[in-house]
């Protein structure tokens, strides 16, 4: 290709409009001023350059903020966001939700890039942790955000966020990101009544010890079985065959179902058989009958 | 999957016409955006026409007057009707289509393979 380099007479560029797009790349780069498309960028949004075009104007405003560009340009970058690196964004101070926000709906539909997954963490590293708004914004554009974290970012969530979260936020999650968000939401939902914190507290649970679930046996929840499911097996073992038939009330039938599936299996295991008798489902794999049961973990401790 | 095919392209006398033909499947033109571009040997890609709700019609300077883009939206194709061509108009052309989102603004684009058109006695 020809390298050209002045721009030709008559087309150095006043503004920034559709007449740009029937310019070649070299005159884009040759007539446009990087300080007028810095300016103008919101123009940039309304105009179908293509791809190649958007490479020339990105180099311009790269040239023009070697050290990353201002929030004032960011917000408006529209489409071009979709042209720049994480390199590129690790260069960036994002402080406002309407900047953050307005990168996110350019890549709406699409799974999470490496380009968004950076401006998220530089913009959450700036703001210090994970406010109720960011995570509102965040988790309305991609579900499976808050899954995304590992248990030491989680932990920067303060319990009052946990209000913006889904069931479907944590579908992902696996149980060390559980462990660390449950205890922030048995604390943001402190103060409300039995039936109303079951209902917020129940897609945590699978971060919750054996004492709350013991408690919780004592109120009638009524716990379906998808939910006991993802209990944590460790927290599910020392529960007595009463307390999972309260814990489960109606539902208890569908352990039957999920018999050969943990954490239900390893329950079976630690139960006494004439105690699983009493649910009349037909459970197996019980402690026999005169069978002495030693907790040799206790037994450790002791010692 | 989105695909944008031309045709219509070939060996034409100066002073001749042609007319070239964009089909796209996948995407529909009306309410997007499509334009047709060429590449001359040694230059760089430009646009020579193009047609959108959003836009209207534009055409590149050197052919204003002897170009004319259209749209059929029954058959989904964009053409292009090329009068009184000369030597510089001998290119690789190029049909192009870009999505026009609900929320404003563009998003993906896909070209066609190119189809030459030469100018010559």
């Known amino acids: 290709e020809v390298e050209k380099t002045a721009c030709p007479s008559g087309k150095k560029a006043r503004e920034i409009d559709e007449s740009l797009i029937f310019y070649k790349k070299w005159e884009l780069e040759a007539c446009v001023d990087a300080a007028l498309l810095a300016t103008q960028m919101d123009r940039v949004n309304a105009i179908p350059f293509t791809y190649e075009q958007l490479d020339v104007l990105k180099h311009k405003l790269d040239e023009l903020y070697p050290q990353g560009y201002p929030e004032s340009v960011i917000q408006h970058l529209g489409y071009l966001f979709l042209k720049m690196s994480p390199e590129d964004i690790r260069k960036w101070n994002v402080t406002s939700l309407e900047t953050l926000k307005a990168l996110l709906e350019v890549n709406k539909g699409h799974e999470m890039s490496p380009q968004v997954a950076t401006l998220i963490d530089r913009f959450v590293k700036g703001r210090g942790q994970l406010d109720k708004d960011t995570l509102d914004t965040l988790t309305a554009f991609y579900p499976g955000y808050l899954c995304s974290l590992s248990p030491e970012e989680l932990s920067s969530v303060p319990p009052s966020s946990i209000w913006a979260v889904r069931p479907q936020d944590l579908d992902t999650c696996d149980p060390r990101q559980l462990d660390v968000l449950y205890p922030k939401a048995r604390l943001a939902f402190q103060n409300m009544n039995g039936s109303e914190y079951f209902v917020k507290i129940q897609s945590f649970l699978g971060g919750a010890p054996t004492e709350d679930l013991k408690a919780l046996s004592q109120q009638n929840v009524s716990m379906d079985l998808a939910t006991f499911m993802k209990l944590r097996t460790d927290a599910v073992l020392p529960l007595t065959v009463a307390e999972v038939q309260k814990l489960l009330g109606p539902h208890v039938e569908g352990l039957k179902a999920e018999e050969r599936h943990r954490p239900v299996r390893d329950w079976i295991l630690r139960q006494r058989q004439d105690d699983l008798d009493t649910l009349g489902l037909g459970l197996q794999g019980g402690i026999p009958n005169g069978y002495l049961v030693l907790d040799l973990s206790m037994q450790e401790a002791l010692s | 999957e989105v695909q944008v095919v031309e045709s219509g392209g070939g060996l034409v006398q100066p002073g001749g016409s042609l007319r070239l033909s964009c089909a796209a499947s996948?995407?529909?033109?009306?309410?997007?955006?499509g334009g047709w571009f060429r590449q001359a040997p040694g230059e760089q890609r430009e646009l020579v026409a193009s047609?959108?709700?959003?836009?209207?019609?534009k055409y590149a300077d050197p052919v204003k007057g002897r170009f004319t883009i259209s749209t059929d939206t029954a058959k989904n194709t964009v053409d292009l009707q090329m009068n009184s061509l000369g030597p510089e108009d001998t290119a690789v052309y190029y049909c192009y289509a870009r999505v026009r989102l609900s929320r404003g603004g563009w998003g993906s684009e896909y070209w066609g393979q190119g189809t030459q058109v030469t100018v010559s006695s």
């Open positions: 047609m959108s709700s959003a836009l209207g019609t």
């Open positions: 996948g995407i529909t033109f009306s309410g997007n955006y």
